[in-house]
């Protein structure tokens, strides 16, 4: 059969805000195979950090990154 695409899920969400200057990009985790919806921020030190998309700082950070590079996010 066709090769299956691995699903990335978030189990632990960041409990602290990340400085905007440290953020490189983000992607949304919306797969029904995951226990919760999440946002994964990639930092400028190449680290992936899971965060709660319902939190204001997460929404503000996504908006900041959208304005920096206005390419549509999946």
């Amino acid at each position: 059969g066709p090769a299956s695409v691995p699903t990335t899920c978030c189990f632990n969400l960041a409990n602290r805000k990340i400085p905007l200057q440290r953020l490189e990009s983000y992607r949304r985790i919306t797969s029904g195979k995951c226990p919760q919806k999440a946002v994964i921020f990639k930092t400028k030190l190449a680290k992936d950090i899971c965060a709660d998309p319902k939190k204001k700082w997460v929404q503000d950070s996504m908006k900041y990154l959208d304005q920096k590079s206005p390419t549509p996010k999946p």
């Epitope: 602290r16 805000k17 400085p19 200057q21 440290r22 930092t43 400028k44 030190l45 190449a46 680290k47």
Partner: antibody
Framework: QVQLVQSGGGVVQPGRSLRLSCAAS????????MHWVRQAPGKGLEWVAV????????HYADSVKGRFTISRDNSKNTLYLQMNSLRTDDTAVYYC???????????WGQGTMVTVSS | DIQMTQSPSSVSASVGDRVTITCRAS??????LAWYQQKPGKAPKLLIY???SLQSGVPSRFSGSGSGTDFTLTISSLQPEDFATYYC??????????FGQGTRLEIK
Amino acid sequence: QVQLVQSGGGVVQPGRSLRLSCAASGFTFSSYGMHWVRQAPGKGLEWVAVISYDGSIKHYADSVKGRFTISRDNSKNTLYLQMNSLRTDDTAVYYCAGDTDYGDIDPWGQGTMVTVSS
Amino acid sequence: DIQMTQSPSSVSASVGDRVTITCRASQDISSWLAWYQQKPGKAPKLLIYAASSLQSGVPSRFSGSGSGTDFTLTISSLQPEDFATYYCQQASSFPSITFGQGTRLEIK
């Protein structure tokens, strides 16, 4: 417990080289960015360099750019600072320290003294 | 680079005193500020992060406040082990990290 144990300091002549090491234990070293920070005698703290968890990204202070190289060996849980073309104003206690992902620095090694003198 | 300026550069106080150290950033850093304590011959120790959050294991007599450009570290009742040098650090910019010049807290 979380520990960063440093080695490799000493007295060296201007223009020569030295390599500092920082051995980590008590935490998942390969998951963390790492810094070197230095402190000249009687002075404040000066950031030197940072490296990403996987070694793919490195940044340096202008004062050491082109002379110092930060690296890591995750299989040995060890961070390094290769210091070339040393100058007298590089004399300082050098600390290795962990990056928290949030802009602050923790934990810290015990420090190692580097003296550049003729 | 963002410059950090601490005041005073040194302060003398007695056990039980309330002490305040201030830190000013050269530009707005929101709440991205950390405070460290350093004793002679020892490494710095993280006390406060995000301007006002107490690092795990740090006594509650330490507190931080401020946002934007002006920040304060307060020790509510000085203990003998608190005599040390304190540094602020801006955590806003990347990759450059900058520290204040330090405030030495001495026994009166």
